[in-house]
Interface confidence: low
């Protein structure tokens, strides 16, 4: 099945010459970015990118690795060091603080410097660090947050919240002592800390009082409102803006995104995280690509530009379950959102960055034949005379013993969307990994994204490119035709 043209050196030489020609034409833009988009693949380490690329190709009946993801087309790439101040291997809270605020923090804290301590409310005050999204808003830009997780989840919260505990989604999650000390839950901060123009994702239940039935699952008490303070945060948010609209399903979202009277849009499509792409009810819930498009339609109306955070947040969840099928299909939808955003924006005035907050202990190996299924088996047998998959995890719930030994696996089993790849160490949840992750960049000032950098560098590149604090004296020419 090897393509016959690939046997000819001319094929590779010609391909490389074309790539070299394109590289030679790259000209660093000396203009400022009017718009900023950061695409965050939660848990999307390099092994995940590679495996997703192959899957994307195989879904189009190609062999796999020769395929291009949308992010592969970005001309500038760097590596990001993801450690937090207190841990070699970080979580999504500390990393969000790094790439969104430009300062490293401690494990499981958000929007706070490392002087703050996890779960210690009285260390919050005075240690807040300000996100690039907040700075963009102060500069007159429109801002938005789009995610497939809860909008109060660690990664999006890095754009607007300051909390010593990433798990304080609603006031019901905050200990009474911390509430008395004045620490606020993340949902409250979502509507009160700053004016966010577009908020799209999951997380309905944290916005409504306990006992409020969910509109989609009215008979399921566990999906209803969780708040103890009796507040309807959606109602409070709507009251702040004359042109605000709240939607909770795909149809309403598509209508609202085309309505010129809508200036602020909140769409919460699930009580908690949104469903995995493979489980999504496409009549009720929008895809990440659709949410990204809706956000861009609204935000791009502002002549001063916009800041948009787009998260493929459940790549991470698929990996924690050791279900590579879920992680990789989430990655492909994430890449589809990147592609759609590229069609709706111009690299002349929009700096787009794609990165991950951290990696996972997810590996791809075993010398599989070109074109063989990414979910398939490695050729030959292991020392225990059993088959093994090319995708594996270093640890996680895929560790199973059957009669005291590792179970055998067949191609049909490993190809199932529910299959958990095996691991060396048994854990309830597979863990993050500590190796560097990629940062892809396109647009004004993208050339700054190079080399091996601290994760904090990402926030500083965005701020500098758009001449935001602390780089208001950035000395970059405004893009021709930029309006103010």
């Amino acid at each position: 099945i090897i393509p016959v043209e690939e046997e000819n050196p001319d094929f590779w030489n010609r391909q490389a010459a074309e790539a070299l020609g394109a590289a030679k034409k790259l000209q660093p833009a000396q203009t400022a970015a009017k718009n900023l988009i950061i695409f965050l693949g939660d848990g999307m380490g390099v092994s995940t990118v590679t495996a997703a690329r192959i899957l994307k190709g195989q879904k189009k009946d190609k062999l796999g690795p020769e395929t291009f993801l949308a992010m592969d087309r970005f001309p500038y790439v760097a590596l990001s060091k993801t450690y937090s101040v207190d841990k070699h291997v970080p979580d999504s809270g500390a990393t969000a603080t790094a790439y969104l605020c430009g300062v490293k923090g401690n494990f499981q804290t958000i929007g706070l410097s490392a002087a703050a301590r996890f779960n210690q409310c009285n260390t919050t005050r005075g240690n807040e660090v300000i996100s690039v999204m907040n700075r963009a808003k102060k500069a007159g830009k429109s801002v938005g947050v789009v995610t497939t997780t809860r909008v109060q989840h660690a990664s999006p919260a890095g754009a607007y919240a300051h909390t010593v505990n990433r798990n304080w989604y609603s006031d019901a999650d905050v200990p009474a002592s911390a509430r008395q000390e004045g620490c606020q839950d993340i949902a409250t901060q979502l509507i009160s800390n700053m004016d966010i123009d577009v908020i799209l994702g999951g997380g309905r239940k944290y916005m409504f009082p306990m006992g409020t039935p969910d509109p989609e699952y009215p008979d399921d008490y566990s999906q209803g409102g969780t708040r103890l303070d009796g507040k309807n945060l959606v109602q409070e948010w709507l009251a702040k803006h004359q042109g605000a609209r709240y939607v909770w399903n795909r149809t309403e979202l598509l209508q609202a995104s085309l309505d010129p009277s809508v200036t602020h849009l909140m769409g919460l499509f699930e009580p908690g995280d949104m469903k995995y792409e493979i489980h999504r009810d496409s009549t009720l819930d929008p895809s990440l690509m659709e949410m990204t498009e809706a956000a861009l339609l609204l935000l791009s109306r502002n002549p001063r530009g916009f800041f948009l955070f787009v998260e493929g947040g459940r790549i991470d969840h698929g990996h924690h379950e050791s279900r590579a099928y879920r992680a990789l299909t989430e990655t492909i939808m994430f890449d589809d959102a990147i592609e759609r955003a590229g069609q709706l924006t111009s690299e002349e005035d929009t700096l787009s960055l794609v990165t991950a907050d951290h990696s996972h202990v997810f590996s791809f190996g075993g010398y599989p034949l070109r074109g063989s299924s990414i979910f398939g088996l490695a050729p030959g047998k292991a020392r225990d005379r059993k088959a093994y998959t090319v995708l594996l995890y270093g640890n996680g719930p895929g560790y199973v013993l059957k009669d005291g030994a590792r179970p055998d696996v067949t191609e049909s089993e490993s190809g199932s969307p529910e299959y958990r790849q095996q691991s060396a160490v048994p854990l309830d949840g597979e863990t993050h990994a500590g190796e560097d992750v990629a940062v892809f960049a396109r647009g004004p000032q993208a050339h700054l994204v190079h080399g091996v950098q601290e994760q904090t560098f990402i926030a500083h590149v965005m701020a500098f490119a758009a001449c935001l604090e602390p780089y208001t004296a950035c000395d970059l020419a405004p893009r021709a035709g930029t309006t103010d």
Epitope: E128, K137, K138, Y160, S192, N193, M194
Partner: nanobody, 122 residues
Framework: QVQLVESGGGLVQAGGSLRLSCEVT????????MAWYRQAPGRQRELVAI????????????VKGRFTISRNDTKSTMYKSTMYLKMNTLELEDTGVYYC???????????WGQGTQVTVSS
């Protein structure tokens, strides 16, 4: 909602002193800059003194050397800030309503107090 409460105003003779206070309570966020403005009858509101979160200060030329602005940010997590304006060697021209102003750190929103009357008599 954020509340700003001024106090310390009153009637004082020229050459005398007053100390104004402004307490910011119920703030969901830390306070960035804080300032005192004043408005004399028939005049526009004008900046008197301003103090940043880091403590750097600036004064209107007419009050330099006579007025001192200071602030205290409480070290609890209830975002509470108190600002003071010590006014020495008061002049007739210092008469007016003194307003407290605060800017939210995260949203850049401006908050105002109701004002406190300062009257300097001869």
């Amino acid at each position: 909602q954020v509340q700003l409460v001024e106090s310390g105003g009153g009637l004082v003779q020229a050459g005398g002193s007053l100390r104004l206070s402004c307490e910011v309570t119920r703030s969901p966020m830390p306070i960035d800059t804080m300032a005192w403005y004043r408005q004399a009858p028939g005049r526009q509101r004008e900046l008197v003194a301003i103090i940043s979160r880091s403590g750097s200060t600036n004064y209107a030329d007419s009050v330099k050397g006579r007025f001192t602005i200071s602030r205290n940010d409480t070290k609890s997590t209830m975002y509470k800030s108190t600002m003071y304006l010590k006014m020495n060697t008061l002049e007739l021209e210092d008469t007016g309503v003194y307003y407290c102003n605060a800017v939210g750190l995260w949203n850049g929103a401006e908050y105002w107090g109701q004002g406190t009357q300062v009257t300097v008599s001869s």
